[in-house]
């Protein structure tokens, strides 16, 4: 585990006489903010996953108003770093997208308007723990200067943040099977341990000391079931103590999406689904062509050579929306078999399997009958993640321990009387009927004839007699 850090040094017009005018004016003061999206650079997932390594949004920069007649300088920037925590190993090669957004602070109805000023992208090799790497990129008429680095969060160390280190318990050597942590020779490698008390059924961890809850469970140790029955509203942050969902204001209240965009709530904010021809955080960017790169997440743009003809984004697997901006809920495809619980972790799908099943998609049926006994001569049948007994005649129940009443289902037809017998049942037929279940009428001349097949049997089906 660790943190990717991005420092924006400057954003301003590129060199040359064709430099752009300031994006802000006296009539429309504005401020900048930045978004960074990271993907593993060489993984198969990179093309089809959104920011699989993580994403971050900067704070808003200072408000800037253009001075009339003055050339556009480098614009005032937000304070601080953009930090993207990563849970797993640092991949070494990564892809980035950095977007510069403008927030207009004029008298817009419904709050400030956002528009995308510039977007740069690249793929780089970077070892965690190394020095800051610098970059200069042009995007349209703008020039962006930035630095980035990846650093491990203790106790992780190494160029991929995969080795875990703890201070030595004894001064001379590390514990059995644990090596010293170079270059921190006074520390030792440590095994991965979840937070003490983390529920083994409802919690899991991907870094030491963590306890992350499966869907439907909450609390620091994932032992509290989420119950919304006593809650007033299904909106708002979850309370770890009660598991209740506390009411709060809705991010979609007043519909922040412009140009006919539809708003849907996300855990942290809202998301606009834009009609074709519009994009941006609030669907505020229009007159878009393929040249503007409107297709997100590796979508392929077709058509739209001029602003009057709409473009179409062909989305890669896992994405949808007119700009491929929406992730498909991969769990809605129910990839986990045999009742497994689906977890969409962003960078991967994970299935938590029910007892008796295993495999990435819970597709392997473990031996349900191992160690299971069926009483009274019953035989064990595998399936469904739990054993089932096929009981011998006269017995029933989960383990064939219950003596069955063979006459309970009234098996004797035409008024025949049923008697339980050690081998099953015997029917005493009413006058005029014969057969193991009294199913055949006896004809006056003493001959018997098979009638039309009774319900559930076709003529010629083998009749089963006890």
């Amino acid at each position: 585990a660790g943190v990717f850090e991005l420092q924006i040094h400057s954003f301003g017009p590129g060199p040359g006489p064709g430099a752009p005018r300031s994006p802000c004016s006296a009539r429309l003061p504005c401020r900048l903010f930045f978004r960074v999206c990271l993907k593993p650079g060489l993984s198969e997932e990179a093309a089809e996953s959104p920011c699989a390594l993580g994403a971050a949004l900067s704070a808003r920069g200072p408000v800037y108003t253009e001075q009339p007649g003055a050339p556009a300088p480098d614009l005032p920037l937000p304070d601080g770093l953009l930090q993207v925590p990563f849970r797993d190993a640092w991949p070494g090669t990564f892809s980035f997208i950095i977007e510069t957004w403008r927030e207009e602070l004029g008298d817009q109805i419904g709050g400030p308007a956002w528009s995308l000023l510039a977007r740069v992208a690249g793929r780089r090799r970077l070892a965690a723990g190394g020095p800051w790497a610098r970059d200069i990129q042009r995007a349209g008429a703008w020039e962006l200067r930035f630095s980035y680095r990846a650093r491990c969060e203790p106790p992780a160390v190494g160029t991929a943040c995969t080795r875990l280190c703890r201070p030595r318990s004894a001064p001379s050597r590390c514990g059995p099977g644990l090596r010293p942590c170079a270059p921190l020779e006074d520390e030792c490698e440590a095994p991965l341990v979840c937070r003490a008390g983390c529920s083994p059924e409802h919690g899991f961890c991907e870094q030491p000391g963590e306890c992350r809850c499966l869907e439907g469970w909450t609390g620091p140790l994932c032992t509290v079931p989420v119950s919304t029955s006593s809650c007033l509203s299904p909106r708002g942050p979850s309370s770890a103590t009660t598991g209740c969902l506390v009411p709060g204001p809705g991010p979609c209240d007043g519909n922040p999406c412009a140009n006919g965009g539809s708003c849907s709530e996300t855990p942290r904010s809202f998301e606009c689904t834009c009609p074709r021809g519009f994009y941006g955080l609030r669907c505020e960017v229009s007159g878009v062509t393929c040249a503007d790169g409107p297709c997100f997440n590796g979508g392929l743009c077709v058509g739209g050579a001029d602003p009057d003809s709409a473009y179409i984004c062909h989305c890669p697997p896992g994405f949808q929306g007119s700009n491929c901006e929406k992730r498909v809920d991969r769990c809605s495809l129910q990839p986990c078999r045999n009742g497994g619980l689906c977890l969409d972790l962003g960078h991967a799908l994970r299935c938590r399997c029910r007892a008796g099943f295993a495999g990435p998609r819970c597709e392997h049926d473990l031996d349900d009958c191992a160690g299971r006994a069926c009483a009274n001569g019953g035989t064990c049948v595998e399936g469904g993640g739990a054993h089932r007994c096929s009981c011998a005649l006269g017995f029933g129940g989960r383990d064939c321990r219950e003596r069955a009443d063979p006459c309970a289902a009234r098996p004797c037809a035409h008024g025949g009387r049923c008697y339980a017998h050690f081998s099953g049942l015997v029917c005493a037929c009413a006058p005029g009927y014969m057969g193991a279940r009294c199913e055949f009428p006896v004809h006056p001349d003493g001959a018997s004839a098979l009638p039309a097949a009774p319900p559930g049997l076709r003529p010629g089906d083998p009749q089963r007699y006890l």
Epitope: P15, A47, I97, R119, V120, A121, G122, R123, R124, R125, R134, D135, I136, Q137, R138, A139, G140, E143, A291, G293, G298
Partner: antibody, heavy 117, light 107 residues
Framework: QVQLVQSGAEVKKPGASVKVSCKAS????????IHWIRQAPGQGLEWMGY????????EHNQNFKDRVTMTRDTSTSTVYMELSSLRSEDTAVYYC??????????WGQGTTVTVSS | AIQLTQSPSSLSASVGDRVTITCRAS??????LAWYQQKPGKAPKLLIY???SLEDGVPSRFSGSGSGTDFTLTISSLQPEDFATYFC?????????FGGGTKLEIK
């Protein structure tokens, strides 16, 4: 105006080294990187690497392994590229260019290096 | 390294013609593509960067388009000074790589 002026043509023997200079003017020297690109006769363009004059950080194409060294002298706004262990296939025109990671906006006039025994 | 394939490798056209040169990348490079013009005995000159941004001082008859893996350089009406060799260059990954070039000749 922005100008990059390179040193003159060189003739070298195989195994020797060559050092080409690139003097920048017309802009703040430390504001942009200097890249080196070469072009063999009748061939395409091949990026060799760059130096950041502010930090002296360099990155180069793995095709050149440890044969290329880039340095700079801020007092004269000059960047140098040295290529060692020369072989005949290093015969090419060597260009310096100003830029960032996704643009090379001004180029030097080129320096012809001939490697011949 | 990312490979760039330019087509055609050579092209004959007349003054006033509309000419299109294409460049295909071996993988998605977003919009990180530049176009350069090179005349015999001269250094390359930047025409287009980030797929469609025209460099200062370059005539507006030059335009670039595309994103992802397929890119196009268009000269809307050829002028005598446009006969040269054109190279595309990707800047998404390190090392930056160039296409093989398209030689534009007078018909």
């Amino acid at each position: 105006q922005v100008q990059l002026v390179q040193s003159g043509a060189e003739v070298k023997k195989p195994g020797a080294s060559v050092k080409v200079s690139c003097k920048a003017s017309g802009y703040t020297f430390t504001r942009y990187w200097i890249h080196w690109i070469r072009q063999a006769p009748g061939q395409g363009l091949e990026w060799m690497g760059y130096i950041n004059p502010t930090t002296v950080y360099t990155e180069h194409n793995q095709n050149f392994k440890d044969r290329v060294t880039m340095t700079r002298d801020t007092s004269t706004s000059t960047v140098y590229m040295e290529l060692s262990s020369l072989r005949s296939e290093d015969t090419a025109v060597y260009y310096c260019a100003r830029g960032g990671s996704n643009f090379f906006d001004y180029w030097g006039q080129g320096t012809t290096v001939t490697v011949s025994s | 390294a990312i490979q760039l394939t330019q087509s055609p490798s050579s092209l004959s056209a007349s003054v006033g013609d509309r000419v299109t040169i294409t460049c295909r990348a071996s993988e998605n490079i977003y919009y990180n593509l530049a176009w350069y013009q090179q005349k015999p005995g001269k250094a390359p000159k930047l025409l287009i960067y980030t797929a469609n941004s025209l460099e200062d001082g370059v005539p507006s008859r030059f335009s670039g388009s595309g994103s992802g893996t397929d890119f196009t350089l268009t000269i809307s009406s050829l002028q005598p000074e446009d006969f040269a060799t054109y190279f595309c260059k990707q800047a998404y990954d390190v090392p930056p790589t160039f296409g093989g070039g398209t030689k534009l000749e007078i018909k």
